[in-house]
Interface confidence: low
């Protein structure tokens, strides 16, 4: 399922008054595209330009992070008169041009989405034949990748005064809420420890003091699902074991 927010037009010149009806450079991209991790997403990008019937060499580029300076994730080039844009770069082989640049369409398909793909993307077109010109989206399109929670680490660590503490780290979007349950914590306690913190798509919660032997369970939940993992604390001569 892919959701696209309202389109916005990036246009530096069409707001100006011109006596002649010449077309000006502009780029149309949506503000945001949402898709689930593992799925594919389409990043739409269309443009207008002032060079009527241009059929010279062109290059289509998509970059991530920031305009002009961000790393390129996709690049293709079309020879004079050709509608085939030959791919020169496709990061990890997951980016594919859907649009036809000759028809003012640079739309890109991103396969096998991961949470790390959640960033802003910028399209760019370059003409380099008889006409030398180029234009790049300045605001770009935000790719919002959603994912059900996944617990990526749960562990028991030494704490102060011969005590133990537990850490649970999860990833997901929207950021998951974390809850610990276990001996003397109450039955299925839903309270998220105050030490819970988020970093990007990672959320970590700490259980500062494990005072009883037994099974401690970390539950992560967001609107897309839930996940849980457990550690076991058995104090044999001060040692601990976790699974």
């Amino acid at each position: 399922f892919v959701r696209t927010k309202i389109d916005t037009t990036e246009n530096l010149l069409n707001t100006e008054v011109h006596s002649s009806p010449v077309q000006r450079w502009s780029m149309q991209v949506p503000a945001e595209v949402s898709a689930a991790a593992g799925d594919a997403a389409v990043l739409p990008c269309t443009f207008t330009h002032p060079h009527r019937h241009y059929d010279g060499p062109l290059t289509a580029i998509w970059r991530a992070g920031e305009p002009y300076a961000g790393p390129q994730v996709f690049r293709c080039a079309a020879a004079r008169g050709s509608e085939l844009c030959q791919t020169a770069l496709s990061l990890h082989g997951r980016f594919r041009l859907l649009g036809n640049p000759r028809r003012n369409d640079l739309s890109l398909r991103v396969e096998r989405l991961a949470l790390a793909d959640d960033r802003r993307y910028f399209c760019r077109v370059e003409f380099a034949g008889d006409v030398h010109d180029r234009y790049e989206s300045r605001h770009g399109v935000r790719l919002h990748v959603t994912a059900a929670p996944r617990i990526i680490n749960i562990s028991v660590l030494p704490g102060p005064a011969h005590a133990f503490r537990a850490l649970c780290t999860t990833e997901g979007e929207p950021p998951p809420a974390l809850a610990w349950s276990g001996p003397a914590l109450g039955n299925g306690s839903a309270a998220v420890p105050s030490s819970g913190q988020g970093h990007g798509h990672l959320v970590t919660a700490e259980l500062p003091a494990l005072n009883h032997d037994g099974r401690y369970t970390c539950t992560a939940a967001n609107s897309l699902g839930r996940s849980e993992a457990s550690v076991y604390l058995f104090r044999f001569h001060g040692a601990s074991a976790s699974t």
């Epitope: 530096l12 010149l13 707001t15 100006e16 008054v17 011109h18 000006r24 450079w25 330009h49 002032p50 290059t59 305009p67 002009y68 300076a69 390129q72 370059e126 380099a128 006409v131 030398h132 010109d133 180029r134 234009y135 790049e136």
Partner: antibody, heavy 122, light 107 residues
Framework: EVQLLESGGGLVQPGGSLRLSCAAS????????MSWVRQAPGKGLEWVST????????YYADSVKGRFTISRDNSKNTLYLQMNSLRAEDTAVYYC???????????????WGQGTMVTVSS | DIQMTQSPSSVSASVGDRVTITCRAS??????LAWYQQKPGKAPKLLIY???SLQSGVPSRFSGSGSGTDFTLTISSLQPEDFATYYC?????????FGQGTKLEIK
């Protein structure tokens, strides 16, 4: 004849203001982005500011942002640079320059004025 | 900002020599590079744009090449009027930036 002619330079005290003008002739002024480029004595070239053909988009170097304002009057074929809060490091020859292409992007500068000297000193 | 680095900063050559000046960009600028010639007390003059396109009226002994980050300006056979300072400039993105210049002197 295709040409650019700057004026308005001179000696000004730090903190003062100046307005540079650049009169264009021989080409369709409103179709081209225009820029100001400066050159401090004995130094290299430094881009200062660019304005699109219709005047709706303006761009500045960080060193002048908030102090300088570029503008144009297409009915008079004239480009302007209003310089406020001038500093000693703004001392330079200021050139106006025309973009080679007619899009908002200034691909390269194919026509330059003769330059006008701005000296900021107390 | 994109940094442009020219080398050498100065070069001595004789009439008839072949001279090459290089310009390196701090990031990929595709082909969006121009070369200018400037003589003392004069405004710069455009020689080459989009890395390799010769500006109208510029002698064919001037040529440009390169793309990405590395570019060269070549003068195939130096003439007396070619002794000047040469600048490269990127127009890939704002702020536009120039190289520090290469002074071409008579040997």
């Amino acid at each position: 004849e295709v040409q650019l002619l700057e004026s308005g330079g001179g000696l000004v005290q730090p903190g003062g203001s100046l307005r540079l003008s650049c009169a264009a002739s021989g080409f369709t002024f409103s179709s081209y982005a225009m820029s100001w480029v400066r050159q401090a004595p004995g130094k290299g070239l430094e881009w200062v500011s660019t304005i699109s053909g219709g005047g709706g988009s303006t761009y500045y170097a960080d060193s002048v942002k908030g102090r300088f304002t570029i503008s144009r009057d297409n009915s008079k074929n004239t480009l302007y640079l209003q310089m406020n809060s001038l500093r000693a490091e703004d001392t330079a020859v200021y050139y106006c320059a025309k973009a080679i292409g007619s899009s908002w992007y200034s691909d390269a500068f194919d026509l330059w004025g003769q330059g006008t000297m701005v000296t900021v000193s107390s | 900002d994109i940094q442009m680095t020219q080398s050498p900063s100065s070069v001595s050559a004789s009439v008839g020599d072949r001279v090459t000046i290089t310009c390196r960009a701090s990031q990929d600028i595709s082909s969006w590079l121009a070369w200018y010639q400037q003589k003392p007390g004069k405004a710069p003059k455009l020689l080459i744009y989009v890395a390799s396109s010769l500006q109208s009226g510029v002698p064919s002994r001037f040529s440009g090449s390169g793309s990405g980050t590395d570019f060269t300006l070549t003068i195939s056979s130096l003439q007396p009027e070619d002794f000047a300072t040469y600048y490269c400039q990127q127009s890939y993105s704002i702020p536009y930036t120039f190289g520090q210049g290469t002074k071409l002197e008579i040997k």
